[in-house]
């Protein structure tokens, strides 16, 4: 993840970056809305490896909690938000069935707007 | 990935997203910054699986390639810019080693800003 | 860089308890696996036990299966090694040796002794 | 549990001669290897893992090779800071994670 504070920039909205195993995930949402048990270790060729997913959200602590930076505030709300990707994980469904699922991983904290009415 | 404008918001970077194939991808950059080849198939227990990869990257004919939305232009400059993460593949190194590495792909568009010196 | 400080050995008494403490800097010690790496005097390496990022999984070595107790505070980047109902054979150097996201140690403190005698 | 065997238990050499620690298996681990180096009075430092890819920082004179059961740690030219006992470690499957012996390097 890129550090745009080395090149004298601040970001719209602060985040903080982190690698997650499947010991502390244990669930997740894949694609069709259902929840699902992340496996711990995944067979690889001739070997086992932990899952780990490298997972980015919005910085509860960060000085962007209360809005977006640098937003021009006489047209705009402003609100910094996680969202979401998809990675491949070795899963087991409700129904004990063990597969490859593309699963929804915390991956950036972004900034979304609302326009202000009624000024 | 949430889409803001559900929610009647807007994005202060619009991007795109595509699901991308190792096919297509060849190449990526692992940890430790080296070229590897990514792999087209996976193999698993009962068969292989192609690599796919869920890539989201700011969007070159969208309104914000000029600059982010909504920021103060009185005291920001400000970039829409593609971040990166790592997601585990099955990649083959310079030495033609195999195995699952972390490599970087695209995942995010955020905006960056500098403030506007000397006004 | 990465730091990892050992503290809390001594000389215990069969059938006592002891808690070790490693402090940890230099990283997000909240992204890693972290472990207790123990050898005895004069002899090898030994794995103890592991525990995971936010403290979700934990393992132990058979040797020290319900007696040893591995937890974390992340809030303090802090490891622990609690450990009951010791014996002479638990008599080592303790490590802290942190997991690199394949399984292998790339960080190690440099130990505390534990002495467990009569 | 998997069993790792290094050999010999010590090897006497001069500043110079070049060192061949092996590590042996007691099942296939493909390349699920590290090799460690512990000085007296040290903490253990990682050298290789993937059984051949060094770690940062580690001179080019120490070489890792193997895979399955049979790995082999090269110094290629001892130099007087490199005699100490070297440690292998499987990763393969866990846990545990298991350790050889140690091969102890000493100065002839």
């Known amino acids: 993840h890129s550090d745009p504070a080395r090149r004298g920039e601040l970001s719209v909205c602060d985040s903080i970056s982190e690698w997650v195993t499947a010991a502390d995930k244990k669930t997740a949402v894949d694609m069709s809305g259902g929840t699902v048990t992340v496996l711990e270790k995944v067979p690889v060729s001739k070997g086992q490896l932990k899952q780990y997913f490298y997972e980015t959200k919005c910085n509860p602590m960060g000085y962007t909690k209360e809005g977006c930076r640098g937003i021009d505030k006489r047209h705009w709300n402003s609100q910094c938000r996680t969202t979401q990707s998809y990675v491949r994980a070795l899963t087991m469904d409700s129904k004990k069935r063990i597969g490859w699922r593309f699963i929804r991983i915390d991956t950036s904290c972004v900034c979304t707007l609302t326009i202000k009415r009624g000024r | 990935h949430s889409d803001p404008a559900r929610r009647g918001e807007l994005s202060v970077c619009d991007s795109i997203s595509e699901w991308v194939t190792a096919a297509d991808k060849k190449t990526a950059v692992d940890m430790s910054g080296g070229t590897v080849t990514v792999l087209e198939k996976v193999p698993v227990s009962k068969g292989q699986l192609k690599q796919y990869f869920y890539e989201t990257k700011c969007n070159p004919m969208g309104y914000t390639k000029e600059g982010c939305r909504g920021i103060d232009k009185r005291h920001w400059n400000s970039q829409c810019r593609t971040t990166q993460s790592y997601v585990r593949a099955l990649t083959m190194d310079s030495k033609k080693r195999i195995g699952w590495r972390f490599i970087r792909i695209d995942t995010s568009c955020v905006c960056t800003l500098t403030i506007k010196r000397g006004r | 860089d990465v730091q990892l400080v050992e503290s809390g050995g001594g000389v215990v008494r069969p059938g006592e308890s002891l808690r070790l403490s490693c402090a940890a800097s230099?990283?997000?010690?909240?992204?890693?696996?972290m472990n207790w790496v123990r050898q005895a005097p004069g002899k090898g390496l030994e794995w103890v036990s592991g525990i995971s990022g936010r403290g979700g999984g934990t393992d132990y070595a058979d040797s020290v299966k319900g007696r040893f107790t591995i937890s974390r505070d992340n809030s303090k980047n802090t490891l622990y090694l609690q450990m009951n109902s010791l014996r002479a054979e638990d008599t080592a150097i303790y490590y802290c040796a942190k997991e690199t996201l394949n399984i292998f140690f790339d960080y190690w403190g440099l130990g505390t002794l534990v002495t467990v005698s009569s | 549990e998997i069993v790792l065997t290094q050999s010999p238990g010590t090897l006497s050499l001069s500043p110079g001669e070049r060192a061949t620690l092996s590590c042996r298996a007691s099942?296939?681990?493909?390349?699920?290897l590290a090799w460690y180096q512990q000085k007296p009075g040290q903490a253990p430092r990682l050298l290789i893992y993937?059984?051949?890819t060094r770690a940062t920082g580690i001179p080019a004179r120490f070489s890792g090779s193997g895979s399955g059961t049979e790995f082999t740690l090269t110094i290629s030219s001892l130099q007087s800071e490199d005699f100490a006992v070297y440690y292998c470690?499987?990763?393969?499957?866990?846990?545990?994670?298991?350790f050889g012996g140690g091969t102890k390097v000493e100065i002839k």
């Open positions: 099942q296939p681990i493909n390349r699920y």
């Open positions: 470690q499987q990763y393969y499957d866990w846990p545990p994670l298991t």
């Open positions: 993937d059984a051949s």
């Open positions: 230099g990283f997000t010690f909240s992204s890693f696996y």
